[in-house]
Protein backbone atom coordinates (compact mmCIF):
# COMPACT_ATOMS: atom_id res chain seq x y z
CA UNK A 1 0.00 0.00 0.00
CA UNK A 2 1.13 3.52 -0.76
CA UNK A 3 2.10 5.46 2.36
CA UNK A 4 1.24 9.18 2.73
CA UNK A 5 4.73 10.35 1.82
CA UNK A 6 7.57 8.17 0.60
CA UNK A 7 10.35 7.77 -1.93
CA UNK A 8 9.43 5.87 -5.10
CA UNK A 9 11.92 4.83 -7.77
CA UNK A 10 12.17 2.65 -10.84
CA UNK A 11 9.55 0.01 -11.36
CA UNK A 12 7.91 0.84 -8.06
CA UNK A 13 7.32 4.40 -9.22
CA UNK A 14 5.87 3.22 -12.52
CA UNK A 15 3.61 0.70 -10.79
CA UNK A 16 2.35 3.35 -8.37
CA UNK A 17 1.66 5.81 -11.18
CA UNK A 18 -0.25 3.15 -13.09
CA UNK A 19 -2.33 2.45 -10.00
CA UNK A 20 -2.97 6.11 -9.20
CA UNK A 21 -3.65 7.26 -12.76
CA UNK A 22 -5.40 4.16 -14.06
CA UNK A 23 -6.70 4.44 -17.62
CA UNK A 24 -5.65 8.09 -17.84
CA UNK A 25 -1.99 7.21 -18.24
CA UNK A 26 0.80 9.45 -16.97
CA UNK A 27 3.75 11.64 -17.91
CA UNK A 28 7.32 11.43 -16.63
CA UNK A 29 7.69 15.18 -16.95
CA UNK A 30 5.42 18.18 -17.09
CA UNK A 31 5.82 21.27 -19.26
CA UNK A 32 7.81 24.06 -17.66
CA UNK A 33 5.72 26.63 -15.85
CA UNK A 34 6.01 30.31 -16.70
CA UNK A 35 7.57 30.80 -13.30
CA UNK A 36 10.35 28.20 -13.41
CA UNK A 37 10.90 27.82 -17.17
CA UNK A 38 12.23 24.35 -16.37
CA UNK A 39 10.45 21.08 -16.92
CA UNK A 40 9.94 19.05 -13.79
CA UNK A 41 10.06 15.29 -13.69
CA UNK A 42 8.47 12.79 -11.39
CA UNK A 43 11.82 11.05 -11.00
CA UNK A 44 13.27 14.12 -9.36
CA UNK A 45 10.14 14.83 -7.33
CA UNK A 46 9.47 11.31 -6.07
CA UNK A 47 12.70 9.30 -6.31
CA UNK A 48 15.16 11.93 -5.14
CA UNK A 49 12.93 13.05 -2.29
CA UNK A 50 9.67 11.93 -0.71
CA UNK A 51 6.43 12.74 -2.48
CA UNK A 52 2.77 12.34 -1.67
CA UNK A 53 -0.33 11.16 -3.50
CA UNK A 54 -1.37 14.67 -4.52
CA UNK A 55 1.94 15.22 -6.29
CA UNK A 56 1.75 11.85 -8.00
CA UNK A 57 -1.68 12.72 -9.35
CA UNK A 58 -0.37 15.86 -11.02
CA UNK A 59 1.58 13.60 -13.41
CA UNK A 60 -1.54 11.76 -14.56
CA UNK A 61 -2.64 12.53 -18.10
CA UNK A 62 -5.88 14.45 -18.50
CA UNK A 63 -8.65 12.14 -19.71
CA UNK A 64 -10.02 12.86 -23.17
CA UNK A 65 -13.42 14.54 -23.07
CA UNK A 66 -16.21 12.34 -24.32
CA UNK A 67 -18.73 13.77 -26.76
Amino acid sequence: AYRPSETLCGGELVDTLQFVCGDRGFYFSRPASRVSRRSRGIVEECCFRSCDLALLETYCATPAKSE
Epitope: G10, F48, R49
Partner: antibody, heavy 119, light 111 residues
Framework: QVQLQESGPGLVKPSETLSLTCTVS????????WSWIRQPPGRGLEWIGY???????NYNPSLKSRVTMSVDTSKNQFSLKLSSVTAADTAVYYC?????????????WGQGATVTVSS | QSVLTQAPSVSGAPGQRVTISCTGR?????????VHWYQQFPGTAPKLLIY???NRPSGVPDRFSGSKSGTSASLAITGLQAEDEADYYC???????????FGGGTKLTVL
Protein backbone atom coordinates in the same frame (compact mmCIF):
# COMPACT_ATOMS: atom_id res chain seq x y z
CA GLN B 1 23.01 -8.71 -8.29
CA VAL B 2 23.34 -6.13 -11.07
CA GLN B 3 26.83 -5.70 -12.53
CA LEU B 4 28.05 -3.05 -14.96
CA GLN B 5 30.95 -3.02 -17.42
CA GLU B 6 32.07 0.00 -19.44
CA SER B 7 33.74 -0.39 -22.81
CA GLY B 8 35.00 1.91 -25.54
CA PRO B 9 38.10 3.56 -27.03
CA GLY B 10 40.68 4.72 -24.52
CA LEU B 11 41.94 7.45 -26.83
CA VAL B 12 39.85 10.03 -28.67
CA LYS B 13 41.09 12.90 -30.84
CA PRO B 14 40.05 16.50 -30.08
CA SER B 15 36.84 17.60 -31.82
CA GLU B 16 35.75 13.98 -32.29
CA THR B 17 32.97 12.11 -30.49
CA LEU B 18 33.60 10.00 -27.42
CA SER B 19 31.49 6.82 -27.39
CA LEU B 20 31.15 4.47 -24.44
CA THR B 21 28.91 1.48 -23.81
CA CYS B 22 27.81 0.04 -20.49
CA THR B 23 26.79 -3.62 -20.49
CA VAL B 24 24.34 -4.67 -17.79
CA SER B 25 24.30 -8.18 -16.37
CA UNK B 26 22.22 -9.67 -13.59
CA UNK B 27 19.28 -7.36 -14.10
CA UNK B 28 16.91 -5.91 -16.66
CA UNK B 29 17.72 -2.55 -18.17
CA UNK B 30 14.02 -1.71 -18.14
CA UNK B 31 13.80 -1.77 -14.34
CA UNK B 32 16.18 0.92 -13.19
CA UNK B 33 17.63 4.39 -13.76
CA TRP B 34 20.98 4.55 -15.51
CA SER B 35 23.62 7.20 -15.08
CA TRP B 36 27.01 8.34 -16.33
CA ILE B 37 29.56 10.07 -14.10
CA ARG B 38 33.10 11.12 -14.87
CA GLN B 39 36.20 11.95 -12.88
CA PRO B 40 39.06 13.98 -14.40
CA PRO B 41 42.56 12.96 -13.21
CA GLY B 42 43.12 13.97 -9.58
CA ARG B 43 39.72 15.65 -9.33
CA GLY B 44 36.23 14.98 -8.04
CA LEU B 45 33.14 13.33 -9.47
CA GLU B 46 31.02 15.08 -12.09
CA TRP B 47 27.52 13.93 -12.98
CA ILE B 48 26.94 13.70 -16.74
CA GLY B 49 23.33 12.57 -16.87
CA TYR B 50 20.81 9.84 -16.19
CA UNK B 51 17.85 8.29 -17.92
CA UNK B 52 15.03 5.81 -17.54
CA UNK B 53 14.52 3.22 -20.27
CA UNK B 54 11.17 4.79 -21.20
CA UNK B 55 13.06 7.69 -22.73
CA UNK B 56 13.08 10.04 -19.75
CA UNK B 57 16.48 11.76 -19.65
CA ASN B 58 18.21 14.49 -17.68
CA TYR B 59 21.65 15.84 -18.58
CA ASN B 60 24.13 18.07 -16.81
CA PRO B 61 23.32 21.58 -18.12
CA SER B 62 27.01 22.31 -18.72
CA LEU B 63 27.31 19.27 -21.02
CA LYS B 64 23.78 19.05 -22.39
CA SER B 65 24.54 20.39 -25.86
CA ARG B 66 27.17 17.68 -26.41
CA VAL B 67 25.67 14.66 -24.66
CA THR B 68 23.47 11.87 -25.97
CA MET B 69 22.45 8.80 -24.00
CA SER B 70 20.67 5.84 -25.51
CA VAL B 71 19.64 2.33 -24.61
CA ASP B 72 19.56 -1.00 -26.43
CA THR B 73 17.21 -3.22 -24.46
CA SER B 74 17.86 -6.24 -26.71
CA LYS B 75 21.54 -6.20 -25.76
CA ASN B 76 20.94 -4.95 -22.21
CA GLN B 77 23.31 -2.07 -22.89
CA PHE B 78 23.21 1.70 -22.61
CA SER B 79 25.59 4.16 -24.15
CA LEU B 80 27.08 7.63 -23.86
CA LYS B 81 28.13 9.88 -26.70
CA LEU B 82 29.98 13.13 -26.03
CA SER B 83 30.67 15.25 -29.08
CA SER B 84 33.32 17.87 -29.85
CA VAL B 85 35.65 16.68 -27.11
CA THR B 86 38.64 18.61 -25.82
CA ALA B 87 41.45 17.79 -23.41
CA ALA B 88 39.12 18.88 -20.59
CA ASP B 89 37.02 15.78 -21.28
CA THR B 90 39.90 13.48 -20.34
CA ALA B 91 38.61 11.46 -17.40
CA VAL B 92 37.60 8.11 -16.00
CA TYR B 93 34.00 7.54 -17.10
CA TYR B 94 31.71 5.48 -14.89
CA CYS B 95 28.31 4.05 -15.61
CA UNK B 96 26.12 3.59 -12.57
CA UNK B 97 22.69 2.33 -11.65
CA UNK B 98 19.94 3.52 -9.34
CA UNK B 99 18.08 0.31 -8.55
CA UNK B 100 15.45 2.16 -6.56
CA UNK B 101 16.11 0.39 -3.28
CA UNK B 102 18.42 3.20 -2.20
CA UNK B 103 16.23 6.29 -2.50
CA UNK B 104 17.98 7.61 -5.60
CA UNK B 105 21.49 6.71 -4.50
CA UNK B 106 23.71 5.17 -7.18
CA UNK B 107 24.19 1.75 -5.67
CA UNK B 108 25.89 -0.12 -8.50
CA TRP B 109 28.92 1.19 -10.41
CA GLY B 110 31.04 -0.06 -13.25
CA GLN B 111 34.81 -0.25 -12.75
CA GLY B 112 35.35 2.82 -14.93
CA ALA B 113 36.76 3.44 -18.40
CA THR B 114 39.76 5.74 -18.80
CA VAL B 115 39.39 8.06 -21.78
CA THR B 116 42.18 10.35 -22.92
CA VAL B 117 41.54 13.14 -25.39
CA SER B 118 44.71 13.81 -27.34
CA SER B 119 45.87 14.16 -30.91
CA GLN C 1 33.48 25.36 -7.36
CA SER C 2 31.05 22.62 -6.33
CA VAL C 3 27.41 23.32 -5.52
CA LEU C 4 27.80 21.11 -2.44
CA THR C 5 30.72 22.25 -0.31
CA GLN C 6 33.01 19.81 1.48
CA ALA C 7 36.23 20.38 3.36
CA PRO C 8 39.12 19.19 1.16
CA SER C 9 40.62 17.07 3.92
CA VAL C 10 40.06 15.73 7.41
CA SER C 11 42.17 13.49 9.60
CA GLY C 12 41.92 11.46 12.76
CA ALA C 13 43.73 8.84 14.79
CA PRO C 14 42.61 5.21 14.90
CA GLY C 15 39.65 4.76 17.22
CA GLN C 16 38.61 8.40 17.00
CA ARG C 17 35.40 9.84 15.61
CA VAL C 18 35.51 12.12 12.58
CA THR C 19 32.77 14.07 10.85
CA ILE C 20 32.66 15.12 7.21
CA SER C 21 30.23 17.89 6.39
CA CYS C 22 28.42 18.72 3.16
CA THR C 23 26.92 22.18 2.89
CA GLY C 24 24.28 22.91 0.29
CA ARG C 25 21.54 25.46 -0.19
CA UNK C 26 17.79 25.85 -0.43
CA UNK C 27 17.63 24.43 -3.95
CA UNK C 28 19.21 21.09 -3.06
CA UNK C 29 19.57 19.73 0.47
CA UNK C 30 17.34 22.45 1.89
CA UNK C 31 14.61 21.59 -0.61
CA UNK C 32 14.25 18.14 0.87
CA UNK C 33 16.29 16.24 -1.69
CA UNK C 34 18.03 13.20 -0.27
CA VAL C 35 21.76 13.19 0.36
CA HIS C 36 23.93 10.20 -0.50
CA TRP C 37 27.52 9.50 0.49
CA TYR C 38 30.15 7.61 -1.49
CA GLN C 39 33.50 6.18 -0.49
CA GLN C 40 36.27 5.95 -3.06
CA PHE C 41 39.67 4.34 -2.76
CA PRO C 42 42.46 5.33 -5.20
CA GLY C 43 42.05 3.73 -8.60
CA THR C 44 38.65 2.21 -7.87
CA ALA C 45 35.03 3.14 -8.50
CA PRO C 46 33.02 4.96 -5.82
CA LYS C 47 30.88 2.83 -3.52
CA LEU C 48 27.55 3.90 -2.04
CA LEU C 49 28.11 4.30 1.69
CA ILE C 50 24.98 6.11 2.92
CA TYR C 51 21.74 6.64 1.01
CA UNK C 52 18.65 8.70 1.72
CA UNK C 53 20.49 10.86 4.28
CA UNK C 54 20.99 8.20 6.94
CA ASN C 55 20.55 4.68 5.58
CA ARG C 56 23.33 2.14 5.19
CA PRO C 57 23.36 -0.38 2.33
CA SER C 58 23.88 -3.96 3.44
CA GLY C 59 27.51 -4.68 4.18
CA VAL C 60 28.40 -1.16 5.35
CA PRO C 61 29.57 -1.19 8.99
CA ASP C 62 27.47 0.67 11.54
CA ARG C 63 30.54 2.78 12.31
CA PHE C 64 29.34 4.90 9.40
CA SER C 65 26.29 7.09 9.90
CA GLY C 66 24.68 9.98 8.09
CA SER C 67 22.45 12.85 9.10
CA LYS C 68 20.82 15.88 7.53
CA SER C 69 19.65 19.18 8.97
CA GLY C 70 18.49 22.22 7.05
CA THR C 71 20.81 22.85 4.13
CA SER C 72 23.62 20.61 5.40
CA ALA C 73 24.42 16.95 5.78
CA SER C 74 27.09 15.09 7.69
CA LEU C 75 28.86 11.77 7.54
CA ALA C 76 30.22 10.48 10.85
CA ILE C 77 32.75 7.69 11.22
CA THR C 78 33.33 6.27 14.69
CA GLY C 79 36.08 3.92 15.75
CA LEU C 80 38.24 5.11 12.89
CA GLN C 81 40.27 2.38 11.19
CA ALA C 82 43.24 2.51 8.83
CA GLU C 83 41.12 1.03 6.02
CA ASP C 84 38.75 4.03 6.22
CA GLU C 85 41.40 6.20 4.56
CA ALA C 86 39.73 7.22 1.31
CA ASP C 87 37.91 10.04 -0.48
CA TYR C 88 34.30 10.72 0.52
CA TYR C 89 31.73 12.47 -1.67
CA CYS C 90 28.25 13.71 -0.93
CA UNK C 91 25.61 13.87 -3.67
CA UNK C 92 22.12 15.30 -4.01
CA UNK C 93 19.77 16.83 -6.57
CA UNK C 94 19.57 20.56 -7.27
CA UNK C 95 16.30 21.97 -8.57
CA UNK C 96 17.80 25.23 -9.81
CA UNK C 97 20.34 23.35 -11.91
CA UNK C 98 17.85 20.59 -12.77
CA UNK C 99 20.45 17.94 -12.12
CA UNK C 100 22.38 15.80 -9.69
CA UNK C 101 25.33 17.41 -7.97
CA PHE C 102 28.38 16.10 -6.11
CA GLY C 103 30.42 17.71 -3.41
CA GLY C 104 34.08 18.36 -4.18
CA GLY C 105 35.14 15.42 -2.02
CA THR C 106 36.92 15.10 1.31
CA LYS C 107 40.14 13.14 1.69
CA LEU C 108 40.21 11.28 5.00
CA THR C 109 43.64 10.54 6.43
CA VAL C 110 44.03 8.10 9.31
CA LEU C 111 47.03 9.22 11.33
Amino acid sequence: QVQLQESGPGLVKPSETLSLTCTVSGGSISSYYWSWIRQPPGRGLEWIGYFFYSGYTNYNPSLKSRVTMSVDTSKNQFSLKLSSVTAADTAVYYCACITGTTKGGMDVWGQGATVTVSS
Amino acid sequence: QSVLTQAPSVSGAPGQRVTISCTGRSSNIGAGYDVHWYQQFPGTAPKLLIYGNSNRPSGVPDRFSGSKSGTSASLAITGLQAEDEADYYCQSYDSSLSGSVFGGGTKLTVL
